[in-house]
C-alpha cells in the first residue's frame, strides 16, 4: 500500500509548488523501509556495491560536473543547476568556460578552471581546506572538498558567492539519490539535508541511508554484519 501526502512546498525557483510524497507503507503495520534499513535489515546496497545505484551516482556526477550557479537577477537567491534549468531572462548562469575561469593557482596563471562556478564555494575564497601548494583543488567540481572555513569577508565581489544560497544537497529515498533542493522540500520528502555541503558529489547518500557504522570508504558499502543483525 502507498501513503500519499501533498503539500505546498518552497522549491528551488523560489516559488511554492504542490509536491507529492509517496511512502510505501509496511504491509505488516510497522516501521517504514527507511527505518528498517537503519535498524539493520538485509538491504543489499548496504552490504555490497549495487550496479544500479552506482550508475545513478555516476550519472548525477556527470550532470553536476557541467552545472553552474544560477543567480536570480532580483537578488532573491542562487542555486546550483544545469544551464537549461536557469532562466535566461530572470537569472544569470555563472559558468566558467573557455578562457573565462580563474587560474588554477596564483603560481600557474596560464591554466584556467573550466569546471564551476559553484554557488557559495570558490577556491579563491576558501581558507580551509585552502586550494594552494600541493593541495590545489582539481579542475573538476565533483572532486572538490567541502569548504569548512570561508575567508572572513562580508562580500567577495563574486556573483556566485555573494548571493543567498537557496539549495543544498538532499539525500532522498532508499536508493541514495541526491538532489540540490531547499531545506523545506528536503524535509517534506523525508530526506537528509546537508547544510555543510554545496554539491551532491560532496555527500555520500547511501552511507546516510544505511546508517549503523559508517562505511570505511564512503563510496564502498561494507556492512556485511547485516547478515547476522537481522
Amino acid at each position: 500500500a502507498q501513503h500519499v501526502t501533498t503539500q505546498l512546498v518552497l522549491r528551488n525557483k523560489g516559488v511554492y509548488e504542490s509536491v507529492k510524497y509517496i511512502q510505501q507503507e509496511n504491509f505488516w503495520i510497522g516501521p517504514s523501509s527507511i527505518d528498517l534499513i537503519h535498524l539493520g535489515a538485509k538491504f543489499s546496497p548496504c552490504i555490497r556495491k549495487d550496479q544500479q545505484i552506482e550508475q545513478l551516482v555516476l550519472r548525477e556526477r556527470d550532470l553536476e560536473r557541467d552545472s553552474g550557479c544560477c543567480v536570480q537577477n532580483d537578488h532573491s537567491g542562487c542555486i546550483q543547476t544545469q544551464r537549461k534549468d536557469c532562466s535566461e531572462t530572470l537569472a544569470t548562469f555563472v559558468k566558467w568556460q573557455d578562457d573565462t575561469g580563474p587560474p588554477m593557482d596564483k603560481s600557474d596563471l596560464g591554466q584556467k578552471r573550466t569546471s564551476g562556478a559553484v554557488c557559495h564555494q570558490d577556491p579563491r575564497t576558501c581558507e580551509e581546506p585552502a586550494s594552494s601548494g600541493a593541495h590545489i583543488w582539481p579542475d573538476d567540481i565533483t572532486k572538490w572538498p567541502i569548504c569548512t572555513e570561508q575567508a572572513k569577508s562580508n562580500r567577495t565581489g563574486f556573483l556566485h558567492m555573494d548571493c543567498q544560497i537557496k539549495g543544498r544537497p538532499c539525500c532522498i529515498s532508499t536508493k541514495g539519490s541526491c538532489e540540490i533542493t531547499t531545506r523545506e522540500y528536503c524535509e517534506f520528502m523525508h530526506g537528509y539535508f546537508h547544510e555543510e555541503a554545496t554539491l551532491c558529489s560532496q555527500v555520500h547518500c547511501l552511507d546516510k541511508v544505511c546508517g549503523l557504522l559508517p562505511f570505511l570508504n564512503p563510496e564502498v558499502p561494507d556492512q556485511f554484519y547485516r547478515l547476522w543483525l537481522s
Epitope: 580563474p102 587560474p103 596563471l109 594552494s132 572572513k152 562580500r155
Partner: antibody
C-alpha cells in the same frame, strides 16, 4: 580606508643595496587572498612590476631582476619590504607599493596604490 | 614575457569627444587591466577583468576585447580625464604593463 605609504633612502650610490618599506593600513596581510606588490617608474617612463608577496608568504619576482630582489613582510606591523642589491643608475625611479586583491575579479589586480617614493642612484 | 603594445602613444581630444585607445598583446591573454595616472600622482585602477569598472570610476569608461586585442573607451571626454593610461596583464609571469597612452585635452 586602505592606504599604503612607501619610504626609502631617497639617494644612494651605485653598488649599494636599496631598502624600501611599504607601511599600510586598512587591511591585513594575514587576510586570505591578500597581497602587496612593488612597481617602479623611471621619470617620464612606464611602469615595471618588480615583485609581490602573498598572505601565505608566497613570493613572485620579475625574472629579469630576480637575482637582485628580496621581498619580505612583517604581518603584525603591517609592513612589506623590498631590497634591491647592487643598484645602478638605471634603478633611479619612483617606487610604488600596491595592494593586490581579487575582489570580484577572476585574477588579481593592483587595486590600491601608495603615493610612491623617489629613489636616485648617483655617484 | 607578454609584451603589451599601446597605441597611440599620444592623443588629444576635446571635451565631449569619444576616445578609444588600444592595447595589443604579443600572445593571447585572458583579461586586461587598465590604470590611469595623472601627472604627479600614483596610478589608480579603472578597469579589471577586461570590462569591469573599478569602484568609484565614472561610467563613461568602458573596457573591451579578448585574446590579443583590447581597448579602453571614454564615451565623452572630460577635462579630468587628461592622463596617461596603462594596460596590464596578469596572465603570466612576469606581470607586464604597456608603455602607456598619454591623453591630452584639446
Amino acid at each position: 580606508q586602505v592606504t599604503l605609504k612607501e619610504s626609502g633612502p631617497g639617494i644612494l650610490q651605485p653598488s649599494q643595496t636599496l631598502s624600501l618599506t611599504c607601511s599600510f593600513s586598512g587591511f591585513s596581510l594575514s587576510t586570505f587572498g591578500m597581497g602587496v606588490g612593488w612597481i617602479r617608474q623611471p621619470s617620464g617612463k612606464g611602469l615595471e612590476w618588480l615583485a609581490h608577496i602573498w598572505w601565505d608568504d608566497e613570493k613572485y619576482y620579475n625574472s629579469a631582476l630576480k637575482s637582485r630582489l628580496t621581498i619580505s613582510k612583517a604581518t603584525s606591523k603591517n609592513q612589506v619590504f623590498l631590497k634591491i642589491a647592487n643598484v645602478d643608475t638605471a634603478d633611479t625611479a619612483t617606487y610604488y607599493c600596491a595592494r593586490i586583491s581579487n575582489y570580484g575579479s577572476n585574477y588579481w589586480y593592483f587595486n590600491v596604490w601608495g603615493t610612491g617614493t623617489t629613489v636616485t642612484v648617483s655617484s | 614575457q607578454v609584451v603589451l603594445t599601446q597605441s597611440p602613444a599620444l592623443m588629444s581630444a576635446s571635451p565631449g569627444e569619444k576616445v578609444t585607445m588600444t592595447c595589443s598583446a604579443g600572445s593571447s591573454v585572458s583579461y586586461m587591466y587598465w590604470y590611469q595616472q595623472k601627472p604627479g600622482s600614483s596610478p589608480r585602477v579603472l578597469i579589471y577583468d577586461t570590462s569591469n569598472l573599478a569602484s568609484g570610476v565614472p561610467a563613461r569608461f568602458t573596457g573591451s576585447g579578448s585574446g590579443t586585442s583590447y581597448s579602453l573607451t571614454i564615451s565623452r571626454m572630460e577635462a579630468e580625464d587628461a592622463a596617461t593610461y596603462y594596460c596590464q596583464q596578469w596572465n603570466s609571469y612576469p606581470l607586464t604593463f604597456g608603455a602607456g597612452t598619454k591623453l591630452e585635452l584639446k
